[in-house]
């Protein structure tokens, strides 16, 4: 769900961290229309989430602390 | 201690709709996903859907996607989930599971399960 | 959707033997599989998470291990308690779906 960079909608599945590498953060006030998570995945995808989703908030909670920690 | 109470059973005729419960009990309800989970007589398991307590977002299984609804009610640590136009196919026993993302996103409590009978 | 096939389907086993069943994926899932123990006439119960780690309260003749897509779910000394069915699940990304199920029997 992204066009030129931006996501307009958000995915409807739920990811395991074990899936995803990184994550970009999209927010609507720079270009794009909606806030957003865009998950980097193992597959070389790129997944818009919704940022207000608990599964959203724990594994960008996940991957900030594994930055923190290297 | 962590438990789910599933009603034993529930008979209901074809085309009916049946709304079964869950109600928790022993943590705190809305930390937790919770996964209803299909099993007919002498098959598998089959994932129904997923409802966060916290915000009712829900994600459903596309084979289940009209046929299911989730829902919750935080005041009673219920949750709920509706079956509608019930044919035989729909005969089986439904389970609500707690999802822990802690535990590598595991179902780590499961409720006794209702047993649904879809008959004249 | 992800697909998970479990083998063999159904085993028989003799008191202190060890036995391994085997659950594959139609792609990687990368660790993100949990394995079930169901008893007759009872609700299943978590029994491996993350691929390797036991859950709380499980014997600790259970074991599991695999990565990419093949894994595998170890019972050594076999017991007349350990009579059921097991289950994988893959819970990469939803739709989660669980293996057909391995029936385990006492000779």
């Known amino acids: 769900a992204s066009n030129f960079d931006c996501c307009l909608g958000y995915t409807d599945r739920i990811l395991h961290p074990k899936f995803i590498v990184g994550f970009t953060r999209q927010l609507a006030n720079e270009g794009c229309d909606i806030n957003a998570i865009i998950f980097h995945t193992k597959k070389k995808l790129s997944v818009c989430a919704n940022p207000k989703q608990t599964w959203v908030k724990y594994i960008v909670r996940l991957l900030s602390k594994k930055v923190k920690n290297m | 201690q962590v438990q789910l109470q599933q009603p034993g059973a529930e008979l209901v005729k074809p085309g009916a709709s049946v709304k079964m419960s869950c109600k928790a009990s022993g943590y705190t309800f809305t930390n937790y996903w919770m996964h209803w989970v299909k099993q007919r007589p002498g098959q598998g398991l089959e994932w129904i859907g997923v409802?966060?307590?916290?915000?009712?977002?829900?994600t459903y299984n596309q084979k289940f996607k009209g046929k299911a609804t989730l829902t919750v009610d935080t005041s009673s640590s219920t949750a709920y989930m509706q079956l509608s136009s019930l044919t035989s196919e729909d005969s089986a026993v439904y389970y609500c599971t707690r999802g822990n993302y802690g535990v590598d996103y595991a179902m780590d409590y499961w409720g006794q399960g209702t047993s649904v009978t879809v008959s004249s | 959707d992800i697909q998970m096939t479990q083998s063999p389907a159904s085993l028989s086993a003799s008191v202190g033997e060890t036995v391994t069943i085997t659950c594959g994926a139609s792609e990687n899932i990368y660790g993100a599989l949990n394995w079930y123990q169901r008893k007759q006439g009872k609700s299943p119960q978590l029994l491996i998470y993350?691929?390797?780690n036991l859950a709380d309260g499980m014997s600790s003749r259970f074991s599991g291990s695999g990565s990419g897509r093949q894994y595998s779910l170890k019972i050594s000394s076999l017991h007349p308690d350990d009579v059921a069915t097991y289950y994988c699940?893959?819970?990469?990304?939803?739709?989660?779906?669980f293996g057909g199920g391995t029936k385990l029997e006492i000779k």
């Open positions: 409802i966060d307590p916290s915000d009712s977002y829900t």
């Open positions: 993350g691929a390797t």
């Open positions: 699940q893959n819970v990469l990304i939803t739709p989660y779906t």
